[in-house]
């Protein structure tokens, strides 16, 4: 904490500008008015302050807003956001998507920090649900965002938001997460025709039950092996050899390369050898 000292004569800051970079920490503390800083936060990012100087500026804002910063200040924090702790951020009430974008931009290219995770959590909780625009924004900055949420958190995603989800956004989702997302995707895409529906639903099929896979097998979808490998083991096991052959179409030959991996291995083990032989792939049950 910077000691309280009187501001030297002629050094009182009239505005936030480049001259302040030559101020010592104690001079910043004594000569910069917190209210001035708050109204001119947008200028701070254009000035090459040292980390130590930024600490002083943060301290001034903390004193001015002990209950948490107003959104007008938060939106212009820029690199000062990196100085915030999750505890600081928990005091905020961020409602504007523009504010969220501005702060995410500061952290762009880095992994999701505890600060960013707290910010997103505060924002989403404030909105009550993960709407399409928010999801669009978050997955643009963090493709793995959706899969970082718990199944409980994912349950607040409305089916309409599913349209914003790209295949790569689901890459790291586990079965419990896809169990929640799949029914929402099914609902979101229900009015699409067969081939278009399959293109959209494909990424979510890791949460599909056996009945839906059986239905897809009747639609000549030609599922690729990468998608098949992501299916739930318990959904795959009841499928017959004929159903898997129809589901995969020309891709059925790929089963041979995956015969030692789950869920293919478990499925092969549970089939009659005579049925497996009809595939002509040399699979051993």
């Amino acid at each position: 904490e910077v000691e309280k000292t009187a501001c030297p004569s002629g050094k009182k800051a009239r505005e936030i500008d480049e001259s302040l970079i030559f101020y010592k920490k104690w001079e910043l503390e004594a000569c910069v008015d917190a209210a001035l800083l708050a109204t001119q936060m947008d200028r701070v990012n254009a000035i090459p302050f040292t980390y130590e100087q930024l600490d002083v500026l943060k301290h001034k804002l903390d004193e001015l807003y002990p209950q948490g910063y107003p959104e007008s200040v938060i939106q212009h924090l820029g690199y000062l956001f990196l100085k915030m702790s999750p505890e600081d951020i928990r005091k905020w009430n961020v409602t504007s998507l523009e504010t969220l974008k501005a702060l995410l931009e500061v952290n762009k290219g880095h992994e999701m920090s505890p600060q960013v995770a707290t910010l997103i959590d505060r924002f989403v909780k404030g909105r009550g649900q993960l709407d399409k625009d928010t999801l669009d924004t978050l997955t643009a900055f963090y493709p793995g965002y959706l899969c970082s949420l718990s199944p409980e958190e994912l349950s607040s995603v409305p089916p309409s938001s599913i349209w914003a989800v790209r295949p790569q956004d689901l890459d790291t989702c586990d079965p419990r997460q896809l169990d929640v997302l799949y029914p929402k995707a099914r609902l979101a895409f229900q009015n699409m025709n067969g081939s278009e529906y399959f293109v959209k639903i494909q990424s979510f099929l890791g949460g599909a039950p056996t009945e839906d896979l059986k239905a897809l097998s009747q639609q000549n979808v030609s599922m690729d092996l990468a998608t098949f490998m992501k299916l739930r083991t318990d959904a795959v096991l009841p499928l017959t050899v004929a159903e898997v052959q129809k589901l995969l179409g020309p891709h059925v030959e790929g089963l041979k390369a995956e015969e030692r991996h789950r869920p293919v291995r478990d499925w092969i083990l549970r089939q009659r050898q005579d049925d497996l032989d009809t595939l002509g792939l040399g699979l051993q049950g």
Epitope: D174, P175, R176, M229, K230, T233, D234, L237, R260, H261, R262, P263, R265, D266, L269, R270, Q284, G285
Partner: antibody
């Protein structure tokens, strides 16, 4: 409630064959849902999977032990067995039998039986 | 074979601590990774299956996460009965492999 119990000699001479049996009670070795494995743990060391068998007789072995291992199943006795040939002192371990559900993992284990290889 | 590398090999912690154990697979194991707890002289006990699903009867302070090659077991608030050795295991590839184990000791 499925329970597993290992049985077999606690002492085996080098170059001989180690034979163990796992008896399944409270469930069936013929269950289509389950795989039946053998796992071992040398004193003070970690776990090593030996192999599994399905009720149909299909087996899968650890490549490092494959040439010496045979796992078989006897559905009439509700048992599955392990044979490990040409043993050496390095095979001294606690041997566990375990059930694996394809959806979970090794959810049920026997209490383990210590096998020492020594002359 | 897929090698499972666990870290740390041992750690000291106090009751109430948050403990994190990691397991790295030499190639993708998708989400087919399980976690076990073993106490001296006892058989291992399944805690977490399919990377993040809690086995029935296991306290909710245990949680798992990860997919692909990096997996984590977390104990949110360590209890006296949690001092044990923990193992990860992959079952994606037909040659099942275990991690080397992490011994959690009392500080």
């Amino acid at each position: 409630q499925v329970q597993l119990q290992e049985s077999g000699p606690g002492l085996v001479k080098p170059s001989e064959t180690l034979s163990l049996t796992c008896t399944v009670s409270g469930g069936s070795v013929s269950s289509r849902d389950d795989l039946w494995s053998w796992i071992r743990q040398p004193p003070g060391k970690g776990l090593e999977w030996i192999g599994y068998i399905y009720y149909s007789g299909s087996t899968n072995y650890n490549p490092s032990l494959k040439s010496r291992v045979t796992i078989s199943v006897d559905t009439s006795k509700n048992q599955f067995s392990l044979k490990l040939s040409s043993v050496t002192a390095a095979d001294t371990a606690v041997y566990y039998c375990a059930r694996e559900d394809a959806l979970t993992g090794f959810d049920i284990w026997g209490q383990g039986t210590m096998v020492t290889v020594s002359s | 074979d897929i090698q499972m590398t666990q870290s740390p090999s041992s750690l000291s912690a106090s009751v109430g601590d948050r403990v994190t154990i990691t397991c790295r697979a030499s190639q993708s194991s998708r989400y087919y990774v399980n976690w076990y707890q073993q106490k001296p002289g006892k058989a291992p006990k399944l805690l977490i299956y399919a990377a993040s699903s809690l086995q029935s009867g296991v306290p909710s302070r245990f949680s798992g996460s990860g997919s692909g090659t990096d997996f984590t077991l977390t104990i949110s608030s360590l209890q006296p009965e949690d001092f044990a050795t923990y193992y990860c295991q992959q079952s994606y590839d037909a040659s099942y492999t275990f991690g080397g184990g992490t011994k959690v000791e009392i500080k």
